[in-house]
C-alpha cells in the first residue's frame, strides 16, 4: 500500500487536496520525499478507479493513515516499499 520513491524528477503535484479519502477507495499510496528538484514531500494516492490524487502531506488524515499502515506493516505482513536510487 505504501510506496516510497526516490526520483530525479521535479515536483509531480501541481495541486494538492486535503479532502479525506476512505481506505476502501485507495489502491496504493506513493510517497516522494523532498529533494532532487522538488522542495517538498509529495504524497500521491492512487484510487481504485484508477484516478490519482495528490494529497497535502500536512492533512491529518493522511498522516494518521500512513502511521496506521506503518504499524500494521511492522507487526504483520510487510507493506511493499519500492525505492529507486538517486542517480
Amino acid at each position: 500500500v505504501l510506496e516510497v520513491y526516490y526520483t530525479s524528477l521535479r515536483c509531480r503535484c501541481v495541486q494538492e487536496s486535503s479532502v479525506f479519502i476512505p481506505r476502501r477507495f485507495i489502491d496504493r499510496i506513493q510517497i516522494l520525499p523532498r529533494g532532487n528538484g522538488c522542495p517538498r514531500k509529495e504524497i500521491i494516492v492512487w484510487k481504485k478507479n484508477k484516478s490519482i490524487v495528490c494529497v497535502d502531506p500536512q492533512a491529518e488524515w493522511i498522516q494518521r493513515m500512513m502511521e496506521v499502515l506503518r504499524k500494521r506493516s511492522s507487526s504483520t505482513l510487510p507493506v511493499p516499499v519500492f525505492k529507486r536510487k538517486i542517480p
Epitope: 479532502v19 479525506f20 479519502i21 476512505p22 481506505r23 476502501r24 477507495f25 478507479n49
Partner: antibody, heavy 120, light 107 residues
Framework: EVQLVESGGGLVQPGGSLRLSCAAS????????MSWVRQAPGKGLEWVAE????????NYAPSLKDRFTISRDNAKNSLYLQMNSLRAEDTAVYYC?????????????WGQGTTVTVSS | DIQMTQSPSSLSASVGDRVTITCKAS??????VSWFQQKPGKAPKLLIY???YRYTGVPSRFSGSGSGTDFTFTISSLQPEDIATYYC?????????FGGGTKLEIK
Amino acid sequence: EVQLVESGGGLVQPGGSLRLSCAASGIDFSRYWMSWVRQAPGKGLEWVAEINPESTLINYAPSLKDRFTISRDNAKNSLYLQMNSLRAEDTAVYYCARQDDYRNYAMDYWGQGTTVTVSS
Amino acid sequence: DIQMTQSPSSLSASVGDRVTITCKASQDVNTGVSWFQQKPGKAPKLLIYSASYRYTGVPSRFSGSGSGTDFTFTISSLQPEDIATYYCQQYYSTPLTFGGGTKLEIK
C-alpha cells in the same frame, strides 16, 4: 433539486424475488457512487451494497452478497437491487443513497424508501 | 467487520440542554465517520461527515469531533425539532457499518 425515488417494494413470499429501483433526478447520476441501505421495522440502519459510477467496483454486506445484486443504468439514471431467496428477516424499508465524492463519499442524499415485506 | 458502538441508546433532555452522543469504532476508521438524524417515517439526513464537517444547511448547534476510534456528536443547545434518532456510521472500509442509534426525547 436532487431527488431519489425508490420503487419495487411489496409483499413477497419467503424464497421469492424482488427487484427494487431507484430513479435519480437533479444530479449527474453517472458521476456518483450509490448505495442501498435498509431498516427493519423498529430497528437501526444496515448497509446493503454500493456501486461505483462505472459499475466496475461493487461491495456488499457479507451476509447478503450471495442473494442480492446491485446494478445501475446510467443512461436511465437508475439504480437497482435484485433480491433473491428472500427471507422474513429481509423485511425492511430499503433506501437508496448517493455518496458524494466532494464529501469523501458520505451519503448526502437519500430516497424516501420502499417497503419490502417477506411473509407467507 | 468494524463495529460501531453508540451510546447512550436513549436520552432524555430539556430544551436548551447540551447533548452528547458517543460512538466507538472497534478499529481505526481515521476520520471516516458520518452522523445522521432520522425522524419517524422519514429517511435519514446527513448532519456531519468526515467526523467534524457540518453538512450544507445544518445548524451550527450540531457538531462532531474525533478520529481513530473515538467519536463524539454534540447538540450545543437542544431544540424541540431535534427530537429524533441519531446514528453514527463508519465509511472508512467495507462493510459500511452504523451504530445502533440514540433515541433523543424531550424531558
